[in-house]
């Protein structure tokens, strides 16, 4: 009888099924959808999380479509193909043989095509801009306090190395969090900025992926910071390839 058997849960991913019957009596927590035994000491990849979300019972699924003015991720949810390490495959296709290329956060970066479409490599999203609007407060937050609190949040809750939080901008009521992480900067074991941004996005929508933790309770010097709108912009190391007709 081991400690693993007493506490066989996955703190970082509630979309798992856990059992204490792994090798040597270890706890194993398998992600819904993919069935992969995930690492519960860190964030699960966005690709495996989307796969789990799409495998959940339909009555438990809420299709959240981003604001029509956001030029990102406005295709909604899809059931992704993940590579052998849980990352998005560069080419994604649906059941009707419509295919498209995605970046490392799974956002479409080309026009849709057919099965002949080629996506030569998975292009890395190296810069993420999280644009928030907070609910009205008595006064503006102190910028340095806000900066410190958001950096603490990404470090402690999402386990993102502080060097990847490039900046926090604030012009009441808009907050912008810049995450930057080049391929060369990301070491083995580092949380990916795309995964951290996805966990944050789900947190602010009140759909936390963490097991048994309360929702996000953001406070700046005791004052609640309540987010009323979120937009996330993704910048890739190689610019996306959309035809001109999409821009008109």
């Amino acid at each position: 009888h081991t400690a693993a058997q007493d506490n066989c849960t996955c703190p970082t991913n509630k979309m798992t099924v856990c059992s204490p019957d792994g090798p040597g009596g270890r706890c194993q927590c398998r992600a819904l959808g993919s069935g992969v035994a995930v690492d519960c000491s860190t964030l699960t990849s966005k690709c495996l999380l989307l796969k789990a979300r799409m495998s959940a019972p339909k009555n438990a699924r809420t299709l959240v479509r981003p604001n029509e003015h956001a030029l990102v991720d406005n295709d909604g949810l899809y059931d992704p193909d993940c590579d052998p390490e849980g990352r998005f495959k560069a080419r994604q296709c649906n059941q009707t043989s419509v295919c498209w290329c995605v970046n490392s956060v799974g956002v479409r970066r080309t026009d849709k095509g057919d099965l002949s479409l080629r996506c030569d490599e998975l292009v890395r999203t190296h810069h993420i801009l999280i644009d928030l609007r907070h609910r009205p407060t008595a006064g503006a937050f102190n910028h340095s306090d806000l900066d410190a609190e958001l950096r603490r949040l990404f470090r402690e809750r999402y386990r993102l190395h502080p060097k990847f939080v490039a900046a926090v901008h604030y012009e009441q009521p808009t907050i912008q969090i810049e995450l930057r992480q080049n391929t060369s900067q990301k070491a083995a074991g580092d949380v990916d900025i795309g995964d951290a941004a996805y966990y944050f996005e789900r947190d602010v929508k009140g759909e936390s992926l963490f097991q048994g933790r309360g929702g996000l309770d953001l406070r700046v010097r005791g004052e609640p910071l309540q987010v009323e709108r979120t937009l996330i912009y993704y910048l890739d190391e190689i610019p996306p390839k959309f035809s001109m007709k999409r821009l008109t």
Epitope: T2, A4, P23, R26, Q28, A37, D39
Partner: nanobody, 120 residues
């Protein structure tokens, strides 16, 4: 990029044997723990064997004494020898780059799998 390619699956009669292989590339195979995981139709995945980089092996009770996991580090290949097969062993078998933490079993990468069908 990690790649794991299984082979050796097929149809076999109850009581028969099969040997599965998994060719690994894109990582230091000799320094990695590996496992075999199977998924039967309509059931969840279950690990059926585990081998550490040093050669220590683990098996669940369901296959103990019938299955043997081994590795050839010179060939970057993982094996699973399966004897005394029963219809309950029918499943998709995939190999995984895995590890054990203090409390958890984790799969860091996995193959597409090879189908094993045991039927009379």
């Amino acid at each position: 990029q990690v790649q794991l390619q299984e082979s050796g699956g097929g149809m076999v009669h109850p009581g028969g044997s099969l040997r599965l292989s998994c060719a690994a590339s894109g990582f230091t195979f000799s320094g990695s723990d590996m496992s075999w995981v199977r998924q039967a139709p309509g059931k969840g995945p279950e690990w059926v064997s585990y081998i550490t980089s040093g050669g220590t092996t683990y098996y669940p009770d369901s296959v103990k004494g019938r299955f043997t996991i081994s590795r050839d580090n010179a060939k970057n290949t993982l094996y699973l020898q399966m004897n005394s097969l029963t219809p309950d062993d029918t499943a998709l078998y995939r190999c995984a780059k895995a590890r054990l933490t203090d409390s958890h079993y984790v799969e860091d990468a996995w193959g597409q799998g090879t189908q094993v069908t045991v039927s009379s």
